[in-house]
Interface confidence: low
């Protein structure tokens, strides 16, 4: 299709070489009332069409994205050629940064409902460059945490080294939806709730004498609880003795609950006490069996291929530890009678 009629938007993605970050493009199709790009031969700006098939990014989920090769080859369907770019409804997600993402991206509706819709498309010229500004050492991260129940803020990474007074007007989006009230370089959250989690996008306009473009950054925000003040607790085994059958295989499970920690280094291991000896057992890897906002339950099993008489004289000890402290639970095996 002919892309000469598409509206054009220029965007700049300055990525940090220090961190992983993502980027998004929205399919900002113009609204019929505002623009001559859609239905341009049919409506004056004040007229309203009988049906409005394209009402901007809020209602539009069925769009097609293309990339325009720089060598003049035909448009390429994003989904077929670029595995690191994912389409979600009308948003294009770039999972990895890199100058190779520079280029022209075109979106348009999949369903062309009338000949007037042919030019209903947007061309986004994306320039990607690594961040060179070493003067801003403490720019905001592209991954930011908000502490539940307290006050917090979300900073626009590309503007975090500027004071609020210097900062240009910023347009914020959360999960693709415009946050019309927010216009400064950081969003202050008076009280953090779970629903503040999500993907935030901040845009501002930069200009030179020739043209203007949108500088965009993406921030992944997660809501977290405060670091636990408790050492982990062992949920299983509960009993300190376990009835077993000699000669049979046996699996003993150790399940422990670890409270949330931003820097999380859980330890869960089995060791055996036999008279004065104590040694760690190489057992299968630990696995997380339940993870919530507040805590994580981790399980590690010890497997005995056959229970022997000697095992009855041993203590099997599960040891768990976080940054606060450690807990142990020992199990003595007892032969089943009858």
């Amino acid at each position: 299709f002919n892309i000469s009629g598409c509206s054009t938007k220029k965007l700049l993605w300055t990525y940090s070489t220090r961190s992983e970050e993502e980027f998004v493009l929205f399919c900002d199709l113009p609204e019929p009332q505002k623009s001559h790009f859609c239905h341009r031969n049919r409506l004056s700006p004040k007229q309203v069409p009988e049906h409005l098939p394209f009402m901007g990014s809020n209602d539009l989920s069925d769009v097609q994205w293309y990339q325009q090769p720089s060598n003049g080859d035909p448009l390429e369907d994003i989904r077929k050629s670029y595995p690191h770019i994912i389409q979600d409804k009308c948003t294009l997600h770039f999972l990895t940064p890199g100058v190779n993402n520079s280029g022209s991206y075109i979106c348009r509706p999949k369903m062309i409902k009338s000949p007037y819709d042919v030019a209903c498309c947007v061309k986004m010229i994306l320039e990607v460059k690594p961040q060179t500004n070493a003067s801003c050492e403490y720019s905001a991260s592209h991954k930011q945490d908000l502490l539940l129940g307290s006050t917090g803020s979300i900073s626009c990474p590309s503007l975090s080294c500027q004071s609020d007074a210097q900062s240009p007007a910023v347009t914020w989006y959360k999960n693709g939806k415009l946050l019309s009230v927010e216009r400064s370089n950081r969003i202050v959250v008076d009280e953090v709730y779970d629903y503040h989690q999500g993907t935030y996008v901040c845009d501002y306009t930069q200009s030179d004498t020739v043209s203007s473009w949108t500088v965009r950054a993406v921030v992944q925000v997660r809501t977290i609880v405060g670091d636990t003040k408790l050492k982990p607790d062992i949920l299983d085994p509960v009993e300190d003795t376990l009835e077993v059958e000699l000669g049979k295989p046996l699996t003993i499970s150790c399940k422990a609950r670890f409270g949330f920690e931003r820097v999380f280094n859980p330890v869960i291991k089995w060791y055996i006490k036999d008279s004065d000896l104590e040694w760690e057992v190489s057992v299968p890897e630990a696995k997380s069996i339940k993870s919530t906002l507040k805590d994580e339950i981790i399980e590690r099993n010890i497997i005995l291929e056959k229970v022997t008489q000697r095992d009855l004289r041993r203590k099997f000890v599960c040891f768990v530890q976080n940054s606060i402290g450690n807990t142990t639970q020992s199990v003595q095996l007892k032969e089943k009678r009858g």
Epitope: L148, G149, Y193, Y195
Partner: antibody, heavy 117, light 112 residues
Framework: SVEESGGRLVTPGTPLTLTCTAS????????MTWVRQAPGKGLEWIGF?????SAGYASWAKGRFTISKTSATVDLRITGATTEDTGTYFC???????????????WGPGTLVTVSS | AAVLTQTPSSVSAAVGGTVTINCQSS????????LAWYQQKPGQPPKLLIY???TLASGVPSRFKGSGSGTQFTLIMSDLECGDAATYFC????????????FGGGTEVVVK
């Protein structure tokens, strides 16, 4: 548990401070709120103080009440009592239930304030 | 400021019967479900029955059932017992820029 104290008979215009003391939990780890109830009437939310120390108020309560805290207590100051302030004042612990927000889970027995000339 | 309207203001039912109390909010509560129900008996402080619109608080019997979201909420009490005679209040949590919490006017439940 939570317990309020400081309720008494005062004349209109008198400032009055009510104190809330907690036992069995650390008051500094929870948001705490004040709720009042006029005799035979419904409950009215006054305001809260966050674990971090910042306070929030119902619009009608701004300027009429001040909530503050020490390491062991939460105080409600009635700046200048009026007869409409007569009622039982409850101090309540708030708990965070997840994505929808906070609720009032642990209530004190209340302290009675009577404002009369 | 948000207003919670509770209906009816008073209701009477027999032991073993069922009572329904409605709570309508003038604006949507936080996350569509930041609504709680409290029970208050004479001379006592209120007690939390239900939070998140439908989650039973610890120790509350399953005869109490909360439902609804956004602006319309309902408390249904079935298999009524004499001990259920009390005043019931709904309470909502709202956007951080507005009155943060509001209570309904209360419903007096009489069990005969």
């Amino acid at each position: 548990s939570v317990e309020e104290s400081g309720g008494r008979l005062v004349t209109p215009g008198t400032p009055l401070t009510l104190t809330c003391t907690a036992s069995g939990f650390d008051i500094n780890n929870y948001h705490m709120t004040w709720v009042r109830q006029a005799p035979g009437k419904g409950l009215e939310w006054i305001g809260f103080i966050k674990a971090g120390g910042s306070a929030g108020y119902a619009s009608w309560a701004k300027g009429r009440f001040t909530i503050s805290k020490t390491s062991a207590t939460v105080d409600l100051r009635i700046t200048g009592a009026t007869t409409e302030d007569t009622g039982t004042y409850f101090c309540v612990r708030m708990f965070y239930a997840g994505d929808s927000g906070h609720y009032f889970d642990l209530w004190g027995p209340g302290t009675l304030v009577t404002v009369s000339s | 400021a948000a207003v919670l309207t509770q209906t009816p203001s008073s209701v009477s039912a027999a032991v073993g019967g069922t009572v329904t109390i409605n709570c309508q909010s003038s604006q949507s509560v936080n996350n569509a479900k930041n609504l709680a129900w409290y029970q208050q008996k004479p001379g006592q402080p209120p007690k939390l029955l239900i939070y998140d619109a439908s989650t039973l608080a610890s120790g509350v019997p399953s005869r109490f059932k909360g439902s609804g979201s956004g602006t319309q909420f309902t408390l249904i009490m079935s298999d009524l017992e004499c001990g259920d005679a009390a005043t019931y209040f709904c309470a909502g949590g709202y956007d951080r820029f507005i009155d943060t919490f509001a209570f309904g006017g209360g419903t007096e439940v009489v069990v005969k």
